[in-house]
């Protein structure tokens, strides 16, 4: 599989409508929780929790502070931590407990604490429970958590030094934890946790399972460096620990390696960055999307692999185990265990088959089974991705988070749309197309290019958004910017399953928001723009220039995948000649203007889509170069003031028949532009301008001001 191409379109932060939330002197907006039925987004930041409107995050609804006392700060600083940064309360667990309360934990100056937040009063209940094993001590340490039936399952570090990893269940009746032992967890970096409910038609009355995803240092191989291995681990919700062996410890903890690599190369993505579980009525079972980078990542490589959860469950249910080998001088420290496996199967959930053998709970499992799982937590079989290859591999980018939305295109094809954030504050939107990947667009969410720490998806009909959290705030973006595609060709070439062209309104619309009957819409995921209605008569810009000056003709082609070339009177221009130049790879500069430069200039784009080349006329300019007598400004117009030796040029934009309302003519000056009221569209198809404007006086004409006719703002 080849590297993914660059995003087709890049939207700068100011180009698109993004909602933003941030408060002065508040940082680390890294815990996000969406309550879709309440249309509320909860934000856990440093020492504060906010509730904001999920439809417009800039609208704050509530806030509650959870600060660290000066005494606690001082004690924390005594232990060698920074009073200004580390010895504060970073909210790390923000989980729904009931319809009226959240369970919240924070680092609390290296003394983690948890409390209950009432959603009716938006105040803490003041329980101040010990957060040890539920929340890290250190704000820099990894963590993950999920609430399952009112009980918190978490992966974090258990001690001040951060040296003791733990996966635990916080439960009043049956608390459980991992063994503090290298074979169980070896310096893990926790990434994600989620519950997978047993399927209602499960033949053996299975148990709900909680999955944990992390990267840890390999125990099975030894290299000169610390080889990282991505893992998927799972525990059973019904686990109650063992009676003597594994007392109050998981009896169902098993872990396996996640494989994400290019089949045709030795490139292995072994550091897990994020995971998203995709559940959809159209899927046989959940699919999880995992985001990876290679361990030695000096070139900025990222990959996404997708896995069927059933593949992982198969490994845990029927796979071989590994065992520790006491072989000296060997690179392999763990080997496949080929001996007899006790019954019931070690690490298995208590299902009807196990119950039939009279083991009604993990508490009465035989010691042999428990001792075996204690010593063999690692599976020999690995979990392989769908199609045995990554869905996406991207160079020169460090992806940080992923969410995936399953959507149906106009033709009924279902696409898994991947939204992947970067460490430079951008969001990529990508889809798999047969054996390639298409990055539809890149949106700069955060102006100052800071890493996206958290990504959340709301795919509720009519309110589909992505929420991104960073150190400085939260940004809300729609799933698509369909309206930014101003032509049918642009809309189709975007190959965005959310967008379709509506000929009646001549706009690119979001599929799920439009009331138009789908038969009236145009969407071609192959990118075949020939389906668009013929528009031979497009708008053009007319310019008048002074002899000897320089003209810059604008070409607003947004596609990064398109090559731009210029034609003059239907001949392709050689822009590398002394007469012409390119500005920003797209705009045409014409030097030393003479009457011979008058005529029609067309900017065309050439874009490879699948195996076809699509040509588009992006802009048309009509130039007239004159040796002008000293002109007089028409009395009906205000006099244009120009400053110094700056230039002023008249630009006239004319729409030909068939286009939408005529664009006002604009006089561009160095100090601004004067807009004239638009006239009704002409009845004839003549290309002659119907508005006659006297030329604005020009001082030393060296540069041309211009106007975009199809403005993307």
């Amino acid at each position: 599989m080849a590297f993914a191409p660059m995003p087709r379109i890049t939207w700068e932060h100011r180009e698109v409508r993004l909602m933003q939330f941030h408060e002065p002197d508040i940082y680390n907006y890294s815990a996000l929780l969406l309550s879709e039925d309440q249309d509320t987004l909860y934000i856990g930041a440093r020492e504060v929790i906010f509730a904001v409107n999920a439809l417009n995050v800039s609208e704050k609804q509530h806030e509650v502070h959870w600060k660290v006392s000066e005494d606690k700060k001082a004690k924390c600083a005594e232990k060698g931590k920074s009073k200004q940064t580390e010895c504060l309360n970073y909210i790390r667990v923000l989980q729904p407990l009931s319809a009226t309360s959240l369970y919240v934990c924070g680092t609390n100056a290296f003394q983690p604490a948890c409390d209950y937040l009432s959603l009716t009063s938006f105040k803490f209940l003041g329980r101040n429970e010990d957060g040890k094993g539920r929340c890290p001590f250190d704000p820099a340490h990894s963590y993950t958590s999920v609430i399952v039936d009112g009980e918190l399952y978490s992966g974090t570090s258990y001690n001040f030094l951060g040296s003791e990893p733990i996966i635990s269940r916080n439960s009043s009746s049956s608390p459980l934890r991992t063994e503090y032992a290298i074979p169980w967890l070896n310096e893990p970096n926790f990434v994600f946790a989620d519950v997978i409910r047993k399927s209602p038609d499960s033949p053996n009355g299975g148990d709900d399972r909680v999955y944990f995803f992390f990267t840890e240092v390999s125990v099975e191989y030894e290299f000169v460096f610390r080889l990282q291995i991505p893992r998927i681990a799972r525990v059973c919700k019904g686990d109650q620990g063992g009676l003597r062996t594994l007392q109050k410890k998981w009896t169902s903890f098993l872990k396996a390696r996640l494989i994400c690599s290019r089949p045709d190369s030795s490139l292995i993505f072994n550091v897990l960055r994020d995971v998203f579980v995709l559940r959809s009525p159209g899927l046989k079972g959940p699919v999880f999307y995992a985001l990876f980078s290679p361990q030695l990542n000096n070139v900025g490589l990222s990959a996404v692999c997708a896995y069927n959860l059933s593949t992982a469950e198969e490994v845990f249910s029927h796979g071989k185990y590994m065992q520790s080998a006491t072989v000296e001088q060997s690179h392999t420290k763990w080997v496949r265990y080929n001996g007899p496996v006790p019954k019931p199967r070690p690490g298995a959930c208590i299902d009807s088959e196990v119950r039939a053998a009279n083991y009604t709970s993990s508490l009465n499992l035989p010691d042999k089974t428990l001792q075996f799982v204690k010593d063999h937590p690692l599976m020999d079989d690995s979990v392989t991705p769908i199609d045995n290859r990554p869905r996406l591999i991207k160079k020169d980018v460090n992806y940080t988070q992923i969410v995936v939305d399953r959507t149906q295109a106009l033709d009924g094809t279902v696409y898994d749309v991947m939204f992947v954030s970067t460490d430079r504050g951008a969001l990529h939107k990508a889809i798999s197309l047969e054996h390639s990947v298409h990055i539809i667009e890149e949106t700069q969410l955060f102006q100052d290019f800071e890493p996206v720490q958290t990504l959340l998806l709301s795919s509720k009909k009519g309110r589909r958004f992505v929420y991104a959290g960073s150190n400085s705030g939260v940004v809300q973006a729609p799933l698509a910017f369909c309206g930014k595609h101003s032509t049918c060709e642009d809309c189709v070439l975007a190959r965005d399953p959310y967008c379709a062209w509506s000929p009646p309104t001549a706009t690119c619309v979001a599929l799920h928001q439009t009331e138009s009957p789908s038969r009236a819409l145009i969407q071609e995921m192959s990118g075949d723009a020939s389906v668009c209605p013929d528009k031979s008569k497009g708008s053009y810009r007319q310019h008048f220039f002074k002899h000897g000056g320089t003209a810059e003709l604008k070409c607003s082609q947004k596609s990064n995948l398109a090559q731009v070339f210029w034609k003059f009177q239907n001949d392709v221009l050689k822009v590398e000649s002394p007469k012409y130049g390119l500005m920003g790879r797209k705009n045409l500069l014409i030097f030393n203007l003479s009457e011979g430069d008058s005529g029609v200039y067309q900017c065309l784009s050439e874009e490879r889509v699948k195996n076809k080349t699509v040509f588009q006329v992006v802009a048309k300019h009509v130039l007239e170069v004159k040796v002008l007598p000293k002109p007089v400004v028409a009395p009906t117009l205000p006099v244009v003031q120009t400053e110094g030796s700056r230039i002023a040029t008249k630009v006239l934009v004319v729409s030909s028949q068939g286009s939408s309302s005529p664009t006002p003519a604009v006089l561009a000056t160095s100090s601004g532009a004067i807009t004239l009221p638009p006239k009704p569209a002409p009845a004839s198809t003549s290309c002659e301008p119907k508005i006659v404007i006297n030329t604005v006086p020009q001082l030393h004409s060296e540069k041309t001001m211009y106007l975009k006719s199809s403005d993307n703002h």
């Epitope: 001690n159 001040f160 040296s163 032992a181 310096e187 109050k248």
Partner: antibody
Framework: QVQLVQSGAEVKKPGSSVKVSCKAS????????MHWVRQAPGQGLEWMGQ????????SYNQKFKGKATITVDKSTSTAYMELSSLRSEDTAVYYC???????????WGQGTTVTVSS | DIVMTQSPDSLAVSLGERATINCKAS??????????MNWYQQKPGQPPKLLIY???NLESGVPDRFSGSGSGTDFTLTISSLQAEDVAVYYC?????????FGQGTKLEIK
């Protein structure tokens, strides 16, 4: 059987350094954390720090940060503790101990006496 | 840091009699119902030897006259019938929170 064998007694001058070794045998060295505990003459036991033999990741009691450096050599199943800038108050018996699943020190080395004297 | 205080500092008990050593932690050493308290025996010139782990679990090979009890902050090591070979210094140690800390030791002698 499982055992930890430590290097012999050392007499050192103030300001110098000493490196104590602890060789493990009879078990998979990489599977268990190794800790170091010191006992000053006539005194109690003090936990100094620990190391993960798989990763070489060490963590220390704040009191011994900058004083002790714990390392491992996996190829020889040996853990080391180096003490720098020795002073007379560093005179003690230093023990290595294996940290077992149940969160306790189940196997101890015989101890290495370090005497700091001018 | 959690401070472990043992009492008494020294104890003289007749052979065959019960010996009880107490250990008090400055804060709870429990986590989710488990008590991370261990007891060690140290004889002169020897390293410490594990007797009891997790407050009440007897290490394999240790005579069953040794037992441990307690939770939270208060723990007890009991020798039900003192033998001559039990003369040693006994240490409690918590492993719930780093830095792991030991009690100052209790010297057990024969009366």
């Amino acid at each position: 059987q499982v055992q930890l064998v430590q290097s012999g007694a050392e007499v050192k001058k103030p300001g110098s350094s000493v490196k104590v070794s602890c060789k493990a045998s009879g078990y998979s060295f990489s599977d268990y954390y190794m800790h170091w505990v010191r006992q000053a003459p006539g005194q109690g036991l003090e936990w100094m720090g620990q190391i993960n033999p798989t990763t070489g990741g060490a963590s220390y009691n704040q009191k011994f940060k900058g004083k002790a450096t714990i390392t491992v050599d996996k190829s020889t199943s040996t853990a080391y503790m180096e003490l720098s800038s020795l002073r007379s108050e560093d005179t003690a018996v230093y023990y290595c101990a294996r940290y077992y699943y149940g969160r306790h020190f189940d196997v101890w080395g015989q101890g290495t006496t370090v005497t700091v004297s001018s | 840091d959690i401070v472990m205080t043992q009492s008494p500092d020294s104890l003289a008990v007749s052979l065959g009699e019960r010996a009880t050593i107490n250990c008090k932690a400055s804060q709870s050493v429990d986590y989710d119902g488990d008590s991370y308290m261990n007891w060690y025996q140290q004889k002169p010139g020897q390293p410490p030897k594990l007797l009891i782990y997790a407050a009440s679990n007897l290490e394999s090979g240790v005579p069953d006259r040794f037992s441990g009890s307690g939770s939270g902050t208060d723990f007890t090591l009991t020798i039900s019938s003192l033998q001559a070979e039990d003369v040693a210094v006994y240490y409690c140690q918590q492993s719930n929170e780093d830095p792991y800390t030991f009690g100052q030791g209790t010297k057990l002698e024969i009366k």
